[in-house]
C-alpha cells in the first residue's frame, strides 16, 4: 500500500496508528479503512494529545523524514463546491467518518475561500522543534493529491479506530513476552490498553533456557461494558521469582507463600476481582453508576451511594440520571419564560422590553419616542404597541401602516372637488378651467372668459387654492372634459371610469395631472373627475404601486 | 440459520459422569459464548455457565462450582459439558444457549435429558 | 447475585384481551450505560425456551407486536395486548447485567 503502520496509541475506547508514506489523502483513508477505521479525528485538545502522541512514537523510529516541515494526513475535508464558513470552528469543513461539528480547531493560518476543488487538512509538523503537549501539531488545509503526487511535504497520516471498549493489558508475574494482535492488524507487545477483539499469544519463560509454556487470550465481553481476557492470576509466575518479578504481576499486594508460590491482594478499601489480579474499589461510585451530570455521593459506612443532581436538574424514575427542571411550570416570568437546560429566561412580549419592578418584569416599548418613531408622521405610543396617524391631506399607507400616502383629492370620493380640471399636489390640490374658461375667486368654479387657444388654465397662485376641507360653492354639473380626435380637448356626455374593488391591484396609467408643461400647445392629461369613480385604492404618483385605502382616522402600526 | 444440535438423553448412575454436547452451526462459532442452562422437572431456568470458544475462556455460576466442565472444539465447532459426581439433584434438561451481542440467549438447543438413577 | 421475584400464576385472562405478567429485581437493571439488561422468555409446553424482549422493551426477531414491555430500575410489566391460544406457557424474566445470570422462577399464563 506505500503504508507502514509504525506507532500505535490506544486511549478510551480508540487505537491511533501513524503510518509513514507519500500517499494522497484518498489512499491515506483507503489505507485505514480496510482495518475498519478512518483518517483520524481531532476533535478537541485531549484527542489531539493522544494523535501527537502517536506521532512522536513514529518520528522516533523514523529516521528517513525528508522535510523538516512534515504534514500528516488526518481526516478533516471539504468537499468541492462547499464553500469556506469563517463562523464555523472547522470552517466548513467536516470528519469523514462523520459527526458533528466540533468546536475544537487549530489552524495554522487563516483560512483563502476556495470553492473549486475538494481541500483537506493535514497536521503540520515541524521536525526542528520537540513535540511538546503544550505546542500541539497546527491544522494546514491545501490540495488532496493523487495517486502519485500527494501533495508538499506529505510524509504520512494518522488511522483511528473506534472500539466498544477496552481490556487491560495482561500481567506477568514471571519472564515472558506477551504480542498483541488488534483487529486494525498492528501486532505490539506494549499497550496500555487493549481493544475488544485483540488477542494475546503468552510465551513464558526466558528464552532457550526454559521449556516455554504458551498461552492464548481474548479480549472480550465479559459482561455489559465490562472488558476482559478471562485469564485466572499472574500469567508466567516462578517459584524463582515469586513477587520480585514485576510485582508478581499483581495490581496491588503482592504476597508470598514459603513454597515460592503467591497471592494477589488489594489494599483497604478495594476487592480482588475474578482475575485474580486486578483490585476494584469498594466505593460504589468508583463504577460511576451516576450519569447526566449527576454525581455520586456515598452512603453512611461506604455501603450504598445516592446520585445528586447539579442545580436547574432532578434524578428521573432510575434516580441515576438527571434531567431538566421545567422552571417555567412555576411560572417565574410576567409575560413570557423559555426553559433551558439547567435553568430558564424570561423573554417579553413583541412591544415590551426587560425592565419594571421585579425578576423578569417586561415594561412597554415607547415606539413614539424621539429618535425611534417608526411613523413618517404622527405617532400615538399604546400599551405594548402604537399607531400612527397622518396630517390632513394624507392617508396611512405601506405594508406596516407606518407611511403616509397624499390623498389624491382629484378622484377621491363623495366626487369632484373643482368644477372644471383638477391638479392634485402634496397633501392638496388645485382647480383649473379650459381654455376660454377662467377660475372664479372661490378656487373651484369657472367662469367664462376671453377666448384662448392656449392651453388649460393652470393652478391658480397659491392663495386661489382650493380649500381642503371642501367649497360650499355648488358644483356645476357640467360635462367632463375627455380628449378628442385631434387631440385637444372637447366636451362629451359623461365618460365612465371603471370601479375599482378595494382589493384590486392597481396597474393602469397614472391619470393624475401631474401640472401643464409651460410649452405652448403642449400639456399633460390632467386627472378628469367621475363622478361614477367608486372609493377604493388610489394609484400613487406615477400609478406603479398599488396601495389599499386607509382611513385618516389613524391605524395600528404593525409591531 | 443458526442452529443448536443437543446430544440425546442420558441415564446413568449416582457418582458417575456424563458428558453431552451441542454442535453449532449458521453463525461464527468462535465468536459468541455458549451458554449452559439448567431446568429440573417442573421447576424454573438455572444459568449453569458458559464457555467463549474463540479462547476457551469460562465462567460457572457458583452455585454448580465444580459440578461440571466446559470445554469447546473450534474445528467441529461443538461445545461439551461434563457433569460429575451425578446425583439425583443434577436430574434435569440442560439446554445449550447462544449469548448474542445484545445479552440476549438468543438460540436455544433442543435439550439433553440427564436422569440419574441406580 | 440478583434475585428476581414472579409470580407463579397470572390471573385467568379470556382469548383476545390482554394480559399482564410482572417481575420484580432485587437491583437495579438500569447500567450506567443507559440500558437496562433485563430480558423476557416464553416456554410453551414441551418446547425449549424462546426469547421475547431483550433490553427492556426490544422486540426480538419474529415475536408479534402484541408483545410489549416497560418499567424501571427493578420492576417490570410484560403486556400482552391481545391474547392468543398459543401465547400460552411460562414466561420467565432474566437479567443479564451481572454474573451469575438469573432467571425469575416463572409465571404462567393461563386461559380461562
Known amino acids: 500500500t506505500g503504508a507502514d503502520t509504525e506507532a500505535v496509541v490506544c486511549v478510551g475506547t480508540a487505537c491511533y496508528t501513524a503510518h509513514s508514506g507519500k500517499l494522497s489523502a484518498a489512499e491515506a483513508q483507503n489505507h485505514c479503512n480496510q482495518n475498519g477505521g478512518n483518517l483520524a479525528t481531532v476533535k478537541s485538545k485531549e484527542e489531539a494529545q493522544h494523535v501527537q502522541r502517536v506521532l512522536a512514537q513514529l518520528l522516533r523510529r523514523e529516521a528517513a523524514l525528508t522535510a523538516r516541515m512534515s504534514k500528516f494526513w488526518i481526516g478533516l475535508q471539504r468537499e468541492k463546491g462547499k464553500c469556506l464558513d469563517p463562523s464555523l470552528p472547522l470552517k466548513g469543513f467536516s470528519w469523514v467518518g462523520g459527526g458533528e461539528d466540533t468546536p475544537y480547531s487549530n489552524w495554522h493560518k487563516e483560512l483563502r475561500n476556495s470553492c473549486i476543488s475538494k481541500r483537506c487538512v493535514s497536521l503540520l509538523l515541524d521536525l526542528s522543534q520537540p513535540l511538546l503537549p503544550s505546542r500541539l501539531p497546527k491544522w494546514s488545509e491545501g490540495p488532496c493529491g493523487s495517486p502519485g503526487s500527494p501533495g508538499s511535504n506529505i510524509e504520512g497520516f494518522v488511522c483511528k479506530f473506534s472500539f466498544k471498549g477496552m481490556c487491560r493489558p495482561l500481567a506477568l508475574g514471571g519472564p515472558g513476552q506477551v504480542t498483541y494482535t488488534t483487529p486494525f492488524q498492528t501486532t505490539s507487545s506494549s499497550l496500555e490498553a487493549v481493544p475488544f477483539a485483540s488477542a494475546a499469544n503468552v510465551a513464558c519463560g526466558e528464552g532457550d533456557k526454559d521449556e516455554t509454556q504458551s498461552h492464548y487470550f481474548l479480549c472480550k465481553e465479559k459482561a455489559p461494558d465490562v472488558f476482559d481476557w478471562g485469564s485466572s492470576g499472574p500469567l508466567c509466575v516462578s517459584p524463582k521469582y515469586g513477587c520480585n518479578f514485576n510485582n508478581g504481576g499483581c495490581h496491588q499486594d503482592c504476597f508470598e507463600g514459603g513454597d515460592g508460590s503467591f497471592l494477589c491482594g488489594c489494599r483497604p478499601g478495594f476487592r480482588l476481582l475474578d482475575d485474580l489480579v486486578t483490585c476494584a474499589s469498594r466505593n460504589p461510585c468508583s463504577s460511576s453508576p451516576c450519569r447526566g451530570g449527576a454525581t455520586c455521593v456515598l452512603g453512611p459506612h461506604g455501603k450504598n451511594y445516592t446520585c445528586r443532581c447539579p442545580q436547574g436538574y432532578q434524578l428521573d424514575s432510575s434516580q441515576l440520571d438527571c434531567v431538566d427542571v421545567d422552571e417555567c411550570q412555576d411560572s417565574p416570568c410576567a409575560q413570557e419564560c423559555v426553559n433551558t437546560p439547567g435553568g430558564f429566561r424570561c423573554e417579553c412580549w413583541v412591544g415590551y422590553e426587560p425592565g419594571g419592578p421585579g425578576e423578569g418584569a417586561c415594561q412597554d416599548v415607547d415606539e413614539c419616542a424621539l429618535g425611534r418613531s417608526p411613523c413618517a408622521q404622527g405617532c400615538t405610543n399604546t400599551d405594548g404597541s402604537f399607531h400612527c396617524s397622518c396630517e390632513e391631506g394624507y392617508v396611512l399607507a405601506g405594508e406596516d401602516g407606518t407611511q403616509c400616502q397624499d390623498v389624491d383629492e382629484c378622484v377621491g370620493p363623495g366626487g369632484p372637488l373643482c368644477d372644471s380640471l383638477c391638479f392634485n399636489t402634496q397633501g392638496s390640490f388645485h382647480c383649473g378651467c379650459l381654455p376660454g374658461w377662467v377660475l372664479a375667486p372661490n378656487g373651484v368654479s369657472c367662469t367664462m372668459g376671453p377666448v384662448s387657444l392656449g392651453p388649460p388654465s393652470g393652478p391658480p397662485d397659491e392663495e386661489d387654492k382650493g380649500e381642503k376641507e371642501g367649497s360650499t360653492v355648488p358644483r356645476a354639473a357640467t360635462a367632463s372634459p375627455t380628449r378628442g380626435p385631434e387631440g385637444t380637448p372637447k366636451a362629451t356626455p359623461t365618460t365612465s371610469r371603471p370601479s375599482l374593488s378595494s382589493d384590486a391591484p392597481i396597474t393602469s396609467a397614472p391619470l393624475k395631472m401631474l401640472a401643464p408643461s409651460g410649452s405652448p400647445g403642449v400639456w399633460r392629461e390632467p386627472s378628469i373627475h367621475h363622478a361614477t369613480a367608486a372609493s377604493g385604492p388610489q394609484e400613487p404618483a406615477g400609478g406603479d404601486s398599488s396601495v389599499a385605502t386607509q382611513n385618516n382616522d389613524g391605524t395600528d402600526g404593525q409591531k | 440459520q443458526v442452529q443448536l444440535q443437543q446430544s440425546g438423553p442420558e441415564l446413568v448412575k449416582p457418582g458417575a459422569s456424563v458428558k453431552i454436547s451441542c454442535k453449532a452451526s449458521?453463525?461464527?462459532?468462535?465468536?459468541?459464548?455458549l451458554n449452559w442452562v439448567k431446568q429440573r422437572p417442573g421447576k424454573g431456568l438455572e444459568w449453569f455457565g458458559r464457555?467463549?470458544?474463540?479462547?476457551?475462556?469460562?465462567d460457572y455460576n457458583g452455585k454448580f462450582k465444580g459440578k461440571a466442565t466446559l470445554t469447546a472444539d473450534k474445528s467441529s465447532s461443538t461445545a461439551y459439558m461434563q457433569l460429575r459426581s451425578l446425583t439425583s439433584e443434577d436430574s434435569a434438561v440442560y439446554f445449550c444457549?447462544?449469548?448474542?451481542?445484545?445479552?440476549?440467549?438468543?438460540?436455544w438447543g433442543q435439550g439433553t435429558s440427564v436422569t440419574v438413577s441406580s | 447475585d440478583i434475585v428476581m421475584t414472579q409470580a407463579a400464576f397470572s390471573n385467568p385472562v379470556t382469548l383476545g384481551t390482554s394480559a399482564s405478567i410482572s417481575c420484580r429485581f432485587s437491583?437495579?437493571?438500569?447500567?450506567?450505560?443507559?440500558?437496562?439488561?433485563l430480558y423476557w422468555y416464553l416456554q410453551k409446553p414441551g418446547q425449549s425456551p424462546q426469547l421475547l424482549i431483550y433490553?427492556?422493551?426490544n422486540l426480538a426477531s419474529g415475536v408479534p407486536d402484541r408483545f410489549s414491555s416497560s418499567g424501571s430500575g427493578t420492576d417490570f410489566t410484560l403486556r400482552i395486548s391481545r391474547v392468543e391460544a398459543e401465547d400460552v406457557g411460562v414466561y420467565y424474566c432474566?437479567?443479564?447485567?451481572?454474573?451469575?445470570?438469573?432467571f425469575g422462577g416463572g409465571t404462567k399464563l393461563e386461559i380461562k
Open positions: 432474566a437479567q443479564n447485567l451481572e454474573l451469575p445470570w438469573t
Open positions: 433490553q427492556m422493551s
Open positions: 437491583k437495579s437493571l438500569l447500567h450506567s450505560n443507559g440500558i437496562t439488561y
Open positions: 449458521g453463525y461464527a462459532f468462535s465468536s459468541y459464548w
Open positions: 464457555i467463549y470458544p474463540g479462547d476457551g475462556d469460562t
Open positions: 444457549v447462544r449469548g448474542d451481542g445484545y445479552w440476549a440467549m438468543d438460540y
